[in-house]
């Protein structure tokens, strides 16, 4: 977890706090979901590995006009050391697999919870 960057803020944000805030936001999205998230938009699936924050942002940044994930997009940009723009793809994308944003968020949430636990207990 020590490699995770903080958000743009008045002072440095501890990585575990930043990760916790991202998880809380994803929890809010999944709990408050009434209609299909982002109108059922599809995004590239990603490998949940070391560079997944940038990969996740690269996937989600291609979804436009979906206010529900705007905060998540901003938060992920705080974890990604380079600028990400629409249409960008990393090797971490599973390029032949597209999934709904809702499923993408659920998968990401489960993985981040696991990372958070590992950080807490190791």
């Amino acid at each position: 977890l020590t490699c995770l960057g903080g958000f743009a803020s008045p002072g440095p944000v501890p990585p575990s706090t930043a990760l916790r805030e991202l998880i809380e936001e994803l929890v809010n999205i999944t709990q408050n979901q009434k209609a299909p998230l982002c109108n059922g938009s599809m995004v590239w699936s990603i490998n949940l590995t070391a560079g997944m924050y940038c990969a996740a942002l690269e996937s989600l940044i291609n979804v436009s006009g979906c206010s529900a994930i705007e905060k998540t997009q901003r938060m992920l940009s705080g974890f990604c050391p380079h600028k990400v723009s629409a249409g960008q793809f990393s090797s971490l994308h599973v390029r032949d697999t597209k999934i709904e944003v809702a499923q993408f968020v659920k998968d990401l949430l489960l993985h981040l919870k696991k990372l958070f636990r590992e950080g807490q207990f190791n």
Partner: antibody
């Protein structure tokens, strides 16, 4: 339905060791952290420590360092706490407790408690 | 370590009363606070998590509020089954710490 079922009451002599078990059902064992809490007779609750069953990584209260050892067996969905060098002050009810940190809190589910009595 | 100071340590109330229990943390705990109810000889039961979120199945007469260092558990209309001891817990950082407890007795 989530259940945490603990092993039965124990009576031990001072200096002895006891190992308490906590068998989980109703959720995937490795999905939630597992914690242990002490309650001495007529007293409040005190956190002993916790374990990530997936990795075996632990965190503990400094007060219980060298006293409590936490382990988890993924093959049987069971968490264990071993208490060593028992003294009369260790007489208490010990609870295992778990939950989703972000959805209900880490102490959402509780075992029924195990009474450990230390007496010569 | 974060200290959790709970007050009062005990209180007497009647059925139908509004009851308020407070918990003060020695530092900001980012609302990572739970409330528990415990009856004699039984395991604690989770009521509230994240300071104000009601656990599934818990009656709506229980509510939690507060942020930063000051938190409150409110029972809007005390019922006979609510006579018990209540504890707060901070889980913002290790070591997790409980308040000393509040015993709610029948007046």
């Amino acid at each position: 339905e989530v259940q945490l079922v603990q092993s039965g009451a124990e009576v031990k002599k001072p200096g002895a060791t006891v190992k308490i078990s906590c068998k989980v059902s109703g959720y995937t064992f490795t999905d939630y952290e597992m914690h242990w809490v002490q309650q001495a007779p007529g007293k409040g609750l005190e956190w002993i420590g916790g374990i990530d069953p997936e990795t075996g990584g632990t965190a503990s209260n400094q007060k219980f360092k060298g006293k409590a050892t936490l382990t988890a067996d993924k093959s049987t969905d069971t968490a264990y706490m071993e208490l060593s060098s028992l003294r009369s002050e260790d007489t208490a009810v010990y609870y295992c407790t778990s939950g989703d940190y972000f959805g209900g809190g880490p102490f959402a589910y509780w075992g029924q408690g195990t009474l450990v009595t230390v007496s010569s | 370590d974060i200290q959790m100071t709970q007050s009062p340590s005990s209180l007497s109330a009647s059925v139908g009363d509004r009851v308020t229990i407070t918990c003060k943390a020695s530092q900001d705990i980012n609302s990572y606070l739970s409330w528990f109810q415990q009856k004699p000889g039984k395991a604690p039961k989770s009521l509230i998590y994240r300071a104000n979120r009601l656990v599934d199945g818990v009656p709506s007469r229980f509510s939690g509020s507060g942020s930063g260092t000051d938190f409150t558990l409110t029972i809007s209309s005390l019922q006979p089954e609510d006579f018990a001891t209540y504890y707060c817990l901070q889980y913002d950082e290790f070591p997790y710490t409980f308040g000393g407890g509040t015993k709610v007795e029948i007046k």
